[in-house]
Amino acid sequence: EEELQMIQPEKLLLVTVGKTATLHCTVTSLLPVGPVLWFRGVGPGRELIYNQKEGHFPRVTTVSDLTKRNNMDFSIRISSITPADVGTYYCVKFRKGSPENVEFKSGPGTEMALGAKPSAPVVLGPAARTTPEHTVSFTCESHGFSPRDITLKWFKNGNELSDFQTNVDPTGQSVAYSIRSTARVVLDPWDVRSQVICEVAHVTLQGDPLRGTANLSEAIRVPPTLEVTQQPMRVGNQVNVTCQVRKFYPQSLQLTWSENGNVCQRETASTLTENKDGTYNWTSWFLVNISDQRDDVVLTCQVKHDGQLAVSKRLALEVTVHQKDQSSDATP
C-alpha cells in the first residue's frame, strides 16, 4: 500500500503507423499537490511527451479534462503514430517542492510497439495425389506480422493436429516476421470431403484468428475396387456382363473391355454415381454375343484411374448347353 499509486494497466501497446495510440494512466490519490507529466524513456535523457501545465504538444491530447475537479485519469492520446514513436512511456507524478517540483512517483511504464497484422494464411498441399493410409504434408504460410509472438494451429475436420513443425523468421529483431508451418496428415479413405485448416492467432487480431484452408480432395486418390459379374438372364443371344468400379476418387477414369485379349471397340452402356463420402461408382455393361461362342470366352474389364497403372478384373464366361440350345433355337 502506498500514499499514491500510478497505474499504467498495459505493459505493451501495439499501434499501427498513422493511427492514434492511447496511453492509459490513473492515480489513486490527488495528493500530494503537483502535476502529472508523460515521458518516453528513463534517466536524464528521457523525452518529455506531455506536460499539462506548460509546453506545446500538437500531437498529444488528454482523454479526460485535467482541469476538472477530482480527475484521476491522466491518460493521453498520441496521433499520427510513426516508427519514431516506439519506446516505453511513463506517467510521472511530481509534487510541489521548494523551490521547484520534485519527482514523486512513476508509473511502471507502457511499451509502445508497432504492430502489424499477419497476412491471410495460405495453405498448400502436396504436388501429387496420395492414397489412403499414407502421410501427406501441408504447408501454411503467413507474412508481415509484428511483434514476433504468434500462435499457429492445425485442424483436420475440426480436430486439432499435433504432428507439425513451425518456424518464425527471422530469429532476430525485425520490423516484420513470417511464419511457415508443415503439418503431416495421414489420409483416410473417407477424406475426399475433409478439410485441413491452418489457424493463426496474433495480438493484432484481437482474438479473431485468421484461417487458411485446403481440401483433402486435392491431395487424395482413392483407387477403385473392381467386380465383374455375369447377369443370369440373357437377352436374345446375348449375355450381359457388368463391371462395377467402386469407391474411387478423383472422377478421372478410363474403362475398356477385352474379349479373349482383344480390345472391344464397341460402346457399352454405363452410369456414374457419387457416394456420400465424395467417392464415385462407375457401372459398365457389356453385351456378349453367345450364338457362335465357344466355351472358353474370357472377358476383361480394365480400368485406368487418374493416370495410374491399369487394373483389371477377368470373367470366364459361363455359357451352359441349355443357353447354346436356346441360342441356336433363336438363330435360324
Epitope: E2, L31, V33, G34, D65, L66, N71, K96, S98
Partner: antibody, heavy 114, light 111 residues
Framework: EVQLEESGPGLVAPSQSLSITCTVS????????VNWVRQPPGKGLEWLGI???????DYNSALKSRLSISKDNSKSQVFLKMNSLQSDDTARYYC????????WGQGTSVTVSS | DIVLTQSPASLAVSLGQGATISCRAS??????????MHWYQQKPGQPPKPLIY???NLESGVPARFSGSGSRTDFTLTIDPVEADDAATYYC?????????FGGGTKLEIK
Amino acid sequence: EVQLEESGPGLVAPSQSLSITCTVSGFSLTGYGVNWVRQPPGKGLEWLGIIWGDGSTDYNSALKSRLSISKDNSKSQVFLKMNSLQSDDTARYYCARAGKMDYWGQGTSVTVSS
Amino acid sequence: DIVLTQSPASLAVSLGQGATISCRASESVDSYGNSFMHWYQQKPGQPPKPLIYLASNLESGVPARFSGSGSRTDFTLTIDPVEADDAATYYCQQNNEYPWTFGGGTKLEIK
C-alpha cells in the same frame, strides 16, 4: 490497523534541543510520508514539516534553520529534532500520516522550562 | 505564506440546526483543477480528526451531515443538522503551497 505513536522527553531546558520519535504501524514508511504538527496549549495547529516516502523533506520556512526530520524505514520510526528551544516551543507535538493527514498520533507534550 | 482566516472564531448552534464555518485564504489554493483545502475536527485532549479533503470530499466514516464547498480562496464547512457530539473546534488547512498552514480554528458550541 494504522497507528502512530509519539514519544518525547516531556521537559526540555531552554536553548536545548528536542528529539521526538514517531513509531508507526499498519503502513510502510517507504510508501507514505509523515508530517509533524504542533499545538501550543489553548492555541491552533502549526505544520512543522514532512518526510516523504523517498526520504526527501520539506519544512516550514519559519523553523527550517533549527528543524530536522529523518527516519528509519526498517524500524518504522520517524524522528523530529529541533534545536535552540524557547518557551514558545512549548506545545503538544503530533505526527500525522501523509499529505492528506488522514491518521494522527495522540501527541506528546513538550514543555520548555528551566 | 498563505494565511487562512476562519470565521467566526466561535459559534453556538441549537441542536438540529445547521452550522456554517468559513475559511478564507490569502491566495488561491487551487492547482491542477483541484482545491487543496481540508477540514479537521478536534475535541479537547484528542488529536485532530480529518473530515473533508480536497474542499468537498468526505473522509471515510464521516457522517453525511458534514459537507464542504468552495474553490480558490473561499471555502465553507457545513454541518446540518448539528448533533451534540459535534461540539469541537474545527480547522481548515491548505497544502497547496509551502509552508502548509492551518486556520486559527472555529469553536462550535451546541445549545
